[in-house]
Interface confidence: medium
């Protein structure tokens, strides 16, 4: 029946610890007498038997979902509007695999097994950005910001850790950034400063290490932003 179809991308790739939203639409004719029945949608892992296995996500409130995907996989779309969009946050390696959607409305029940979504979870290659506003002068305090702008709002907030031999204290913290107040000494020049970010929802960690450039106030103040390209190389942007 050409009226029975599901439209979703064949595969999606997400880095470990990050998030993805997969748009999805489904169609299925239903008998007139079920027009007022609620529409329940379910995402199942491939290989699941509907009567035996819990779904990874559903909008049915009294339906148990798989323990390992609870709170991370959400049926974000509204099935009553033919929307089966799936949200995955805190992606984990074990989320790798294929998933199929099932709809139930009254006596009409259908698993869209010929159009499955393949989820690929890859290594976290993104690294934190470290912002140093202006030159680091000996014995003068500066606010260094470590941020992960590529992380998503819906995920479990990351945990920031700083490592430095220089005298430091923690400043303001937002969901995706942490400020370190550093008061470098002349002997801290050339030493390492590391910002480590752990994504507890997936148990994955990423970090960036820079070398402190401590010098007496220069004529030409600059802002160093350590960005990198995820390859492990460090770039310096001067502004």
């Amino acid at each position: 029946d050409p009226r029975v179809r599901l439209e979703v991308q064949e595969s999606v790739t997400v880095q470990e610890g990050l998030c993805v939203l997969v748009p999805c639409t489904f169609f299925h004719p239903v008998p007139y007498h079920t027009r007022n029945s609620p529409v329940h949608g379910y995402w199942f892992r491939e290989g699941a038997i509907v009567s035996l296995d819990s779904p990874v996500a559903t909008n049915k409130l009294d339906q148990e979902v798989r323990e390992e995907t609870q709170g991370r996989f959400r049926l974000l779309g509204d099935p009553s509007r033919n929307n089966c969009s799936l949200s995955i946050v805190d992606a984990r390696r074990r989320d790798n695999g294929s998933y199929f959607f099932r709809m139930e409305k009254g006596s009409t029940k259908y698993s869209y097994k010929s159009t499955q979504l393949s989820v690929h979870v890859t290594d976290l290659t993104h690294r934190p950005q470290i912002l140093i506003p202006g030159a680091l002068d000996p014995d003068h305090s500066k606010n260094l910001t470590c941020s992960v702008p590529w992380a998503c709002e819906q995920g479990t907030p990351p945990i920031f850790s700083w490592m430095s031999a220089a005298p430091t204290s923690l400043g303001l913290r937002t969901t995706h950034s942490s400020v370190l107040i550093i008061t470098p000494r002349p002997q801290d020049h050339g030493t390492n400063l590391t910002c480590q970010v752990k994504f507890p929802g997936a148990g994955v960690t990423t970090e960036r290490t820079i070398q402190l450039n401590v010098s007496y106030a220069s004529q030409n103040p600059r802002t160093d932003i350590f960005l990198g390209d995820g390859s492990g190389k460090q770039g310096v942007v001067q502004g």
């Epitope: 491939e46 038997i49 509907v50 074990r94 698993s111």
Partner: antibody, heavy 117, light 106 residues
């Protein structure tokens, strides 16, 4: 091309256990569920249970609950079925089969298990 | 568990005949039904999945139909290699097989 290769013939005493292996080659082992199905001589097919290797969770037919254990070793792409407290009526050919949608699309060659005193 | 009842249990037919095997479920199973063929000493082979979808590599003379509780496997023109035992199996609630239909040469 995907293949399911099972371990060889077994002869067991009543009351003992048997463990049959099923090695998957030619495809991603953990993406699919693997079921075990048995067939007594001259009889029909009977589903015993199945495992989804990527999760490691198994489900069993009510008849075999408590007597069968299905496991999977992702490192060797091998599924196992262990049946305990064997009796003569467990004499059968045991097949592993790969789930594809709502069907078994690929089957192992079968393992004959004879239970005799 | 859902019971599947196949009929007939055995059937004699000739090459070129059109053959129909039915499978009735004890309760509705939507379209979660497959048909497989088994020859003596061999593992079963998938023919039809999702009640009516033909497995790749299976000749088009095989077709499946039905939904809910009543399903049919049809072989439009029997070939010598089609003489075997046919099983239906359901995947809607746990997994169960029909008792089989043995197709013999008349």
């Amino acid at each position: 091309q995907v293949q399911l290769v099972q371990s060889g013939t077994e002869v067991k005493k009543p009351g003992s256990s048997v463990k049959v292996s099923c090695k998957v080659s030619g495809d991603t082992f953990s993406s699919y569920a693997i079921s075990w199905v048995r067939q007594a001589p001259g009889q029909g097919l009977e589903w015993m249970g199945r495992i989804i290797p990527i999760i490691g969770i198994a489900n069993y037919a009510q008849k075999f609950q408590g007597r069968v254990t299905i496991t999977a070793d992702k490192s060797t792409s091998t599924a196992y079925m262990e049946l305990s407290s064997l009796r003569s009526e467990d004499t059968a050919v045991y097949y592993c089969a790969r789930h594809w949608l709502d069907a078994f699309d690929i089957w192992g060659q079968g393992t004959m298990v004879t239970v005799s005193s | 568990d859902i019971q599947l009842t196949q009929s007939p249990s055995s059937l004699s037919a000739s090459v070129g005949d059109r053959v129909t095997i039915t499978c009735r479920a004890s309760q509705g199973i939507s379209s979660a039904l497959a048909w497989s063929q088994q020859k003596p000493g061999k593992a079963p082979k998938l023919l039809i999945y999702d009640a009516s979808s033909l497995e790749s590599g299976v000749p088009s003379r095989f077709s499946g139909s039905g939904s809910g509780t009543d399903f049919t496997l049809t072989i439009s023109s029997l070939q010598p290699e089609d003489f075997a035992t046919y099983y239906c199996q359901q995947f809607n609630s746990s997994i169960t097989f029909g008792q089989g239909t043995k197709l013999e040469i008349k």
